[in-house]
């Protein structure tokens, strides 16, 4: 659920880290209504996810570690 590059809601799916190539953070105080993580998938889709959810935090942690180790 995204409009003019802003997420308006969150996916109700759980995505696997092997399906994700990267992410962007959306902050509510920077012109969008809600905080969100925008996952970029191997199918070239952008998926809006709830940054408070367990699986979302796990993937963000995983990808952040990868970037640090590069």
């Amino acid at each position: 659920a995204s409009n003019f590059d802003c997420c308006l809601g969150y996916t109700d799916r759980i995505l696997h880290p092997k399906f994700i190539v990267g992410f962007t953070r959306q902050l509510a105080n920077e012109g969008c209504d809600i905080n969100a993580i925008i996952f970029h998938t191997k199918k070239k889709l952008s998926v809006c996810a709830n940054p408070k959810q367990t699986w979302v935090k796990y993937i963000v942690r995983l990808l952040s570690k990868k970037v640090k180790n590069m």
Partner: antibody, heavy 121, light 107 residues
Framework: QVQLQQSGAELVRPGASVTLSCKAS????????MHWVKQTPVHGLEWIGA????????AYNQKFKGKATLTADKSSSTAYMELRSLTSEDSAVYYC??????????????WGQGTSVTVSS | DIQMTQSPASLSASVGETVTITCGAS??????LNWYQRKQGKSPQLLIY???NLADGMSSRFSGSGSGRQYSLKISSLHPDDVATYYC?????????FGGGTKLEIK
Amino acid sequence: QVQLQQSGAELVRPGASVTLSCKASGYTFTDYEMHWVKQTPVHGLEWIGAIDPETTSTAYNQKFKGKATLTADKSSSTAYMELRSLTSEDSAVYYCTKCYYGSADYAMDYWGQGTSVTVSS
Amino acid sequence: DIQMTQSPASLSASVGETVTITCGASENIYGALNWYQRKQGKSPQLLIYGATNLADGMSSRFSGSGSGRQYSLKISSLHPDDVATYYCQNVLSTPWTFGGGTKLEIK
């Protein structure tokens, strides 16, 4: 050690509702999603849905939307699944399972003992 | 939804033999595949996760392989204790889906 203790067997009438419980112990309940799986001789194992106890966010298999409702109570580390408008098709063993995260993988690493639901008049 | 096709549906082998169960996905699942063992009257148990990783406490006689759409589970030096139904599971994206199961019997 991790344990998922499920409620006892249920015999229910067609059209009725039933709520199954799953009490977690041995780990931090809010750190992992709880998933529910249906087992029948005909369809084998079917994923019903999951709940994140921290946020109460849910994910459902479209097939079970309107049939199952997942909830969780942080204070008692218990997950619940309500099944409504029961028919003989809902007769099955239902499992709660903890979701494992690690080495960039997801899996159901601990399972409850299962709750048998029989729908019969 | 991603469909998982498991074969064979049942199989009978002798103690000491090596058997292979295969699982095909309707699309690429990038190794997001698990295997479970369900013994009669018991809850399923995680056997292999991430296509190739052996779960804690499971025998090293079990091994998983595959990528893309095709995966397999190999059981070497079959034991009577291996009698069970084995399921593959796609976890790429919900709804997570299971294969139909393979019932393993000992001759």
